[in-house]
Interface confidence: medium
């Protein structure tokens, strides 16, 4: 109640391994939408414009420092004339909430790479994905944007029981001891530990022994 | 004239994961969004979420935990999962287009094309 | 979350008489994301009205929708044996979309 119609309401940042999308309601009626982002100099940067959509991706612009903090903004404008304002002479427009890309964006679902047995070790390898952030027209992976603050947790389990162990590293490898003649499942879970908030992802799918992705040498 | 035409398993035991794809004969996805609805046997109707066709989507809040929607442009089709179901989730599931239609200064929004329904039933 | 609620639960009409049925919202709801549906037993939901006023193709003209705001009324003038059904309000602008609990229009 109390939003005047045209509006944008409810500005919600969607950030997955810095893919990031700021979303808000509701669908237009007689009017566009059109976001603006605030870059490093503090100026307002023009995305979206004109755009019937509820969604902006605004990833190119918040890869270019993602430790930077960011705000944007919906403004709204009669349909077909985005120089059109309102009474006070400004265009109506709602702020979203800060955003800061390091701190904020959501960890993606891990994917185990490859686990290798060597006798009674497995060593297990996560994949380093790949992020939109770039450096010297590089993409770069997890790993290398959060370094060492990124870990990985391993749970892994006798395939015959469900008692689950777990342990933990700061690269993208565990080495576990097994029990020789066992077959064993694993999943990881990305975690950032200095965080307060989106400090998990959600569990990786479980690879087991005796699949495609393992390796067994004596 | 477009049609929906879905499919996916009727009988699920708790804790499993519901699966439904509707694919769209006579017409593109592109331009439209598409939705999927539930209703509990006897209850009305309630609406689970939606997808565009560049794959931006919308999600109940009741439900969003639990719930993925995705499309294929190449087959012309979308589908929802719904993990984690309890007998609560048995329901008449109908995916439908949802359109927002032109007019002159605006746009108007509503389900215009549905499916037909495919019952879901958890149970132990 | 909006909050559509439809009123009365239940219409007990004979055939030639006139059906109103109300869908009231709990926050005022833009005209053009309120529709009208119908449903009989065992088939999906019909659109029947789309922008609070617009009749959908071949929909009878038997069928009006009017109101604003966060009250809207769908109005049967002469009612049909095939009229008889399940009618649902939803506004399909703020997410979630709602749908009203529904009406039954019943042979009297």
């Known amino acids: 109640a109390g939003t005047p119609p045209g509006k944008a309401f409810n500005l919600t940042w969607i950030s997955t391994d810095f893919k990031t999308i700021l979303e808000w309601q509701p669908k237009p009626t007689n009017y566009t939408y059109t976001v603006q982002i605030s870059d490093r100099s503090r100026n307002w940067k023009y995305k979206c414009t004109g755009t019937t959509d509820t969604e902006c991706d605004l990833t190119d612009e918040i890869v270019k420092d993602v430790n930077w903090t960011y705000e944007a903004r919906v403004l709204s404008y009669p349909a077909g004339n985005v120089e059109s304002t309102g009474s006070a002479g400004e265009p109506l427009y709602e702020n979203s909430p800060e955003f800061t890309p390091y701190l904020e964006t959501n960890l993606g679902q891990p994917t185990i790479q490859s686990f290798e047995q060597v006798g009674t070790k497995v060593n297990v390898t996560v994949e380093d994905e790949r992020t939109l952030v770039r450096r010297n027209n590089t993409f770069l992976s997890l790993r290398d944007v959060f370094g060492k603050d990124l870990i990985y947790t391993l749970y892994y389990w006798k395939s015959s029981s469900s008692g689950k162990k777990t342990a933990k590293t700061n690269t993208n490898e565990f080495l576990i001891d097994v029990d020789k003649g066992e077959n064993y499942c694993f999943s990881v879970q990305a975690v950032i530990p200095s965080r307060t908030v989106n400090r998990k992802s959600t569990d990786s799918p479980v690879e087991c022994m005796g699949q495609e992705k393992g390796e067994f040498r004596e | 004239q477009v049609q929906l035409q879905q499919w996916g398993a009727g009988l699920l035991k708790p804790s499993e994961t519901l699966s439904l794809t509707c694919a769209v004969y006579?017409?593109?996805?592109?331009?439209?969004?598409w939705s999927w609805i539930r209703q509990p046997p006897g209850k009305g109707l309630e609406w689970i979420g939606e997808?565009?066709?560049?794959?931006?989507?919308r999600y109940n809040p009741s439900l969003k935990s639990r719930v993925t929607i995705s499309v294929d442009t190449s087959k012309n089709q979308f589908s929802l999962k719904l993990s984690s179901v309890t007998a609560a989730d048995t329901a008449v599931y109908y995916c439908?287009?949802?359109?927002?239609?032109?007019?002159?200064?605006?746009?108007?929004?509503?389900?215009?094309?549905w499916g037909k329904g495919t019952t879901v039933t958890v149970s132990s | 979350e909006i909050v559509l609620t439809q009123s009365p639960g239940t219409l007990s009409l004979s055939p030639g008489e006139r059906a109103t049925l109300s869908c009231r919202a709990s926050?005022?709801?833009?005209?053009?994301?309120l529709a009208w549906y119908q449903q009989k037993p065992g088939q999906a939901p019909r659109l029947l009205i789309y922008?609070?006023?617009s009749r959908a193709n071949g929909i009878p003209d038997r069928f009006s929708g009017s109101g604003s705001g966060t009250d809207f009324t769908l109005t049967i003038s002469r009612l049909e044996p095939e009229d008889f059904a399940v009618y649902y309000c939803?506004?399909?602008?703020?997410?979630?979309?709602?749908f009203g609990g529904g009406t039954k229009v019943e042979i009297k």
């Open positions: 939803q506004q399909a602008g703020v997410v979630p979309y709602t």
């Open positions: 439908a287009r949802d359109t927002p239609y032109y007019y002159e200064g605006g746009y108007y929004y509503y389900m215009d094309v």
């Open positions: 922008g609070a006023f």
């Open positions: 997808i565009g066709a560049s794959g931006s989507t």
């Open positions: 006579g017409g593109s996805l592109s331009g439209y969004y």
């Open positions: 926050d005022s709801v833009d005209s053009s994301y």
